[in-house]
Interface confidence: medium
């Protein structure tokens, strides 16, 4: 049946639509397209006669239509008026007519919307805010986003006006967020810029920090006040009811007992007109001087310098104490204390010795702590690491490499490509790379303080073709029932699929086989001798594929319980005894024999010529595998009878 398919069905203004004809009959004279659902000469767009290959425009032809030999009609630069039905009239060679109708709809490309608000500074728990998405557009759907998430379900959120208006009732400070609206129609979707809702609130009850209320004479009193508030609160301090200053922090140096009393912080929000206060009581005690630490080297170099920390002041008949990282001193040959404990020496500092260090002076009542001292240990740079780890890239992508080396002060970085200096930055970015960007990428890290430099080189390959992969293994000789083996397919490449084969077959399903790392790594848990197969990895992307050479897993196993052959246990006197011992093992085991517990030879075969009844006894074969560290054995009893005394005996080997 003749049908018309519109591609696309929903068309944006200015774009084009193809009315595609399906099941066009054979032996045609020609065809004609009409605007509307019926054949109407006044609304003919274009006619086409096959014999002459002649297209003739009709009254409804706009100059934007192109008819194809397969009867399909392309309409370009679509306008709103083009919406509707289109009829194809087919005239067969036998002059029998056939018709089919198709349709499409035209929608405008939406403009970028914007948000209008009825209240730019709503007050918490009091005001409502209505956001409206502009402009109003016919046949458009309106959506709202809060912090780039769809609207949460809340009785305080209401949509109206065909979802064009979003109302927030009784705003709270938590409504301070980024709001966006979006308009959609079948051909486009546009999102507005963010509108940040600025909710006025507070002040809440202020908090005074620190919480400490007891101070020693000579200390500095530094109180800070904070109250949650928008806009930020204005602060005032009162001591024992007397106004002091309008600041957030109150600082009184070198306090005395006279500074004891009640300290009030008042927070005021000028926009909401609200005030809140908090009171703390401060007590100042008379105390001895606070200790402090001096250092003979403020910037020691790792593994080179020693540092001596001294606790000041020097006071007779005083006990000095030390703490590192808020712990008492660890036992270490690199930490030395002087006889009076006043000087702590760190021999050959490392980057882990930064501290903090505190010293203390013990008196009758308490221990006075110094301020913490942190050592600035200069170290590095260590060998830089270049990330990401990919070495293969496809042409056309962006190459972004980052270099990092542990260093104090932070390292200065340089990039070289094939030995040529490129730039002095930590990151190297090359857009839209081609195969010409393949090469040796060197990151050089330099520590200006120590003068030391370290480099790392990475090979980058840019190619549409994938390389031949190879398999690396974390264990070349795993032991059966004990070890796991991880095979990794090298190299790591972007946008690449990794595949594995065992003995030319795809991976069997087994709980002992696990793929990880984007299928790049194949792990065999608890290997068995049956895992000694040929493993191949493959890599493929949209343009090429390649397989590695096979890697055969060499599983060490055994020795299993040995078998002594022949199985005979009865022999005639005068026969030759020729016993062979075999045990399944990799590598081949070492063999030894014992007769009646007495060690014999270290061979796989035990041969005794012309045996007699004296050779009766237990014959034990011992096997040992040095690689697996395992041993095994079997014992066989041999009976030798005098010639002709017993029928059916073995004649020997």
């Amino acid at each position: 049946k003749l049908t018309i398919e519109s591609t696309p069905f929903n068309v944006a203004e200015g774009k084009e639509v193809l009315l595609l004809v399906h099941n066009l009959p054979q032996h045609l004279f020609g065809y004609s397209w009409y605007k509307g659902e019926r054949v109407d000469g006044n609304r003919q767009i274009i006619g086409y006669v096959i014999g002459t290959q002649q297209a003739t425009p009709g009254p409804a032809y706009s100059g934007r239509e192109i008819i194809y030999p397969n009867a399909s009609l392309l309409i370009q630069n679509i306008i709103q008026n083009d919406t509707g039905f289109y009829t194809l009239h087919v005239i067969k060679s036998d002059l029998v007519n056939e018709e089919a109708t198709g349709q499409f709809r035209v929608y405008p490309e939406l403009p970028k919307p914007s948000i209008s608000s009825n209240n730019s500074k709503p007050v918490e728990d009091k005001d409502a805010v209505a956001f409206t998405c502009e402009p109003e557009t016919q046949d458009a759907t309106y959506l709202w986003w809060v912090n780039n998430q769809s609207l949460p379900v809340s009785p305080r959120l209401q949509l109206s006006n065909g979802n064009r208006t979003l109302t927030l009732f009784n705003v709270t400070r938590n409504d301070t967020a980024s709001y966006k609206c979006e308009t959609q129609n079948p051909v486009s979707a546009r999102r507005s810029d963010s509108v940040i809702l600025n909710v006025l609130y507070g002040p809440d009850a202020p908090t005074i920090s620190p919480l400490n209320t007891s101070y020693r004479s000579g200390e500095n009193l530094n109180l800070s006040c904070h109250a949650a508030s928008n806009p930020p609160a204005q602060y005032s301090w009162f001591v024992n009811g007397t106004f002091q200053q309008s600041t957030q922090e109150l600082f009184i140096p070198n306090i005395t007992v006279n500074n004891s009393g009640s300290y009030t912080c008042q927070a005021h929000n000028s926009d909401t007109g609200l005030n809140r206060t908090t009171v703390t009581t401060i007590t100042v005690y008379a105390e001895p001087p606070k200790p402090f630490i001096t250092s003979n080297n403020s910037n020691p170099v790792e593994d080179e310098d020693a540092v001596a920390l001294t606790c000041e002041p020097e006071i007779q008949n005083t006990t000095y104490l030390w703490w590192v990282n808020n712990q008492s001193l660890p036992v270490s040959p690199r930490l030395q204390l002087s006889n009076d404990n006043r000087t702590l020496t760190l021999l050959s500092v490392t980057r882990n010795d930064v501290g903090p260090y505190e010293c203390g002076i013990q008196n009758e009542l308490s221990v006075d702590h110094s301020d913490p001292v942190i050592l600035n240990v200069l170290y590095g740079p260590d060998d830089p690491t270049i990330s990401p780890s990919y070495t293969y890239y496809r042409p056309g992508v962006n190459l972004s490499l980052s270099c990092h080396a542990a260093s104090n002060p932070p390292a200065q970085y340089s990039w070289l490509i094939d030995g040529n200096i490129q730039q002095h930055t930590q990151e190297l970015f090359i857009s839209n790379i081609t195969e010409k960007n393949s090469g040796l990428y060197t990151c050089q890290a330099n520590n200006s303080a120590s003068g030391h430099s370290r480099t790392t080189v990475k090979t980058i390959t840019v190619s549409a073709e994938l390389p031949k992969p190879s398999i690396s293994s974390n264990n070349s000789k795993p032991v059966e029932d004990k070890d796991a083996v991880a095979f990794t397919c090298e190299p790591e490449a972007q946008n690449t699929t990794y595949l594995w084969w065992v003995n030319g077959q795809s991976l069997p399903v087994s709980p002992r086989l696990q793929l990880s790392n984007g299928n790049r790594t194949l792990t065999l848990f608890n290997v068995t001798r049956n895992d000694a197969r040929a493993y191949v990895c493959g890599i493929q992307n949209s343009v090429s594929a390649n397989r590695s050479d096979p890697v055969t897993l060499d599983v060490l196993y055994g020795p299993d319980t040995p078998i002594i052959s022949p199985p005979d246990s009865s022999y005639l006197s005068g026969a030759n005894l020729n016993l062979s011992c075999h045990s399944a093992s990799n590598p081949s085991p070492q063999y030894s024999w014992r007769i009646n517990g007495i060690p014999q030879q270290h061979t796989q075969v035990l041969f005794i010529a012309k045996i007699t009844p004296n050779n009766n006894g237990t014959y034990a074969c011992f096997v040992s595998n040095l690689a697996t560290g395992r041993n095994n054995s079997i014992v066989k009893s041999i009976t030798v009878s005098a010639s002709g005394t017993s029928p059916g005996l073995s004649a020997g080997a």
């Epitope: 070495t391 094939d418 030995g419 081609t434 195969e435 010409k436 393949s438 090469g439 040796l440 080189v457 990475k458 090979t459 390959t461 190619s463 073709e465 994938l466 390389p467 031949k468």
Partner: antibody, heavy 124, light 110 residues
Framework: EVQLVQSGAEVVKPGASVKMSCKAS????????MHWVKQAPGQGLEWIGW????????EYAPKFQGKATMTTDTSTSTAYLELSSLRSEDTAVYYC?????????????????WGAGTLVTVSS | DIVLTQSPASLAVSLGERATINCRAS??????????MHWYQQKPGQPPKLLIY???NLQSGVPARFSGSGSGTDFTLTISSVQAEDVATYYC????????FGGGTKLEIK
Amino acid sequence: EVQLVQSGAEVVKPGASVKMSCKASGFNIKDYYMHWVKQAPGQGLEWIGWIDPENGDTEYAPKFQGKATMTTDTSTSTAYLELSSLRSEDTAVYYCNTRGLSTMITTRWFFDVWGAGTLVTVSS
Amino acid sequence: DIVLTQSPASLAVSLGERATINCRASKSVSASGYSYMHWYQQKPGQPPKLLIYLASNLQSGVPARFSGSGSGTDFTLTISSVQAEDVATYYCQHSRELPTFGGGTKLEIK
């Protein structure tokens, strides 16, 4: 087929200049660096330098700085090598070469496509 | 510049015999898992032809009797069974920095 076709032999006088050409076919010249290599009679190979046809970037071996100038014309897929202030020791076969399209590579500087060479003879 | 020294300068081998050519670099040409050493064959009146790239990879179309090995500073080109058509001069070339070639080894048939 990937090919580099070089211009014919030249005989030039000492002190003069010579400009030889290397026409690429079977691939887009912009996608690959073009290199030049010198081989004096009975001697080994010496790398002269490379040019990136896409942007004209060049790099020369120190010995050929000031002696050789590499250029390209991407519209004709042709690379040029000009040698100036010629002396008898500049007598040699000059090859253009590049990395071909078939080989997997990890760095840009090995050469599996070579021109047949242009013999330059400097003689008074 | 990295200097490449080839040895021997010339080599005479019987048909079917093994030939070994060495190339030593004045500093390492290996980095990040690759060795940037390549080998070429040049016959009289012809341009060089790539045999081995990245120390051990056989270039497409080159007979399997040619192989390359080595890392760091010492590299070897081996022809397992020399044929009459292998008479040529062989060059090593590195690409760890700006390229340089070795002085060449001339292979002849005894």
